[in-house]
């Protein structure tokens, strides 16, 4: 959910900290486009909803990438 | 601990120039993105400016659009406000701030102000 | 651009009483709103965020509530170190972020 139908991109910060993947309830992996030139991740957390983003360059968050990915490979036939 | 720290702030005339600085510490700089908020003697809180993690993006007041430029520079820790043009309604007490690292605007730490004061 | 107005502008209780804080928009801000306390001298202190999620570090008698246009900052019991002034700040549809004008919570 873009922050405002006038900036640009969501994450105006973003976080280096590892995440739990069992506290995820969702991960959005925004692409770069027109209107945010850069790829977003943004987790929201099962505990208050809270939406937090990810430093798509960390190497914890693309470690829970990989792991969301196996997650979900494992779930489809 | 984490730390904001301003500087910059004098007494200066109309139509003149100043440049406010945020030496930031105890956190990781370059992941947040920062603001910078002011009040005004006696007065509540204005939103002045605010700057992307990474310096992509940058956003202004319209009361100082075109006048004011928000920069940070992550490999020294600095937040930066480049004033010009200032007015008397300028005068205030200006904060730097740290946008919260959720997906949401909100300052969570604020250094403890400078004043400017724009008189002749 | 989004206004936010705070009532009362004063609140005159005595420690130990609920404050119950009002801010009101002049649009819908969905849940974007956050709220500050400011004490003489200081720079302000971030409470809650997301109208409804504490910051870190806040003790649990302060909460937030409401959405679209009206929220509420409650303290359930005030403590000597709460009589300050507090601000509401929207980040809907921004720029501008705009603050209310704050209410001061002051020893009756």
């Known amino acids: 959910v873009p922050l405002s139908r006038t900036v640009r991109c969501t994450c105006i910060s973003i976080s280096n900290q590892p995440v739990n993947p069992r506290s995820l309830e969702k991960l959005e992996i925004i692409p770069a486009s027109q209107f945010c030139p850069r790829v977003e991740i943004i987790a929201t957390m099962k505990k208050k909803g809270e939406k937090r983003c990810l430093n798509p360059e960390s190497k914890a968050i693309k470690n829970l990438l990989k792991a969301v990915s196996k997650e979900r490979s494992k779930r489809s036939p | 601990q984490e730390q904001l720290v301003e500087s910059g702030g004098n007494v200066v005339q109309p139509g003149r120039s100043l440049r406010l600085s945020c030496a930031a510490s105890?956190?990781?700089?370059?992941?947040?993105?920062m603001h910078w908020v002011r009040q005004a003697p006696g007065k509540g809180l204005e939103w002045v400016a605010v700057i992307w993690y990474d310096g992509s993006d940058k956003y202004y007041a319209d009361s100082v659009k075109d006048r004011f430029t928000v920069s940070k520079d992550n490999s020294k820790n600095t937040l930066y406000l480049q004033m010009n043009s200032l007015r008397a309604e300028d005068t205030a007490v200006y904060y730097c701030?740290?946008?919260?690292?959720?997906?949401?605007?909100?300052?969570?730490?604020w250094g403890q102000g400078t004043m400017v004061t724009v008189s002749s | 651009e989004i206004v936010l107005t705070q009532s009362p502008a004063i609140l005159s209780l005595s420690p130990g009483e609920r404050a119950t804080l009002s801010c009101r928009a002049s649009?819908?801000?969905?849940?974007?709103l956050a709220w500050y306390q400011q004490k003489p001298g200081q720079a302000p202190r971030l409470l809650i965020y997301d109208a409804s999620n504490r910051a870190t570090g806040i003790p649990a008698r302060f909460s937030g509530s409401g959405s679209g246009t009206d929220f509420t900052l409650t303290i359930s019991s005030l403590e000597p170190e709460d009589f300050a002034v507090y601000y509401c700040q929207q980040r809907s549809n921004w720029p501008p972020l705009t603050f209310g004008g704050g209410t001061k919570v002051e020893i009756k």
């Open positions: 701030a740290r946008n919260i690292a959720v997906a949401d605007v909100a300052f969570d730490l």
């Open positions: 649009q819908s801000v969905s849940s974007y």
């Open positions: 105890g956190f990781t700089f370059s992941t947040y993105g």
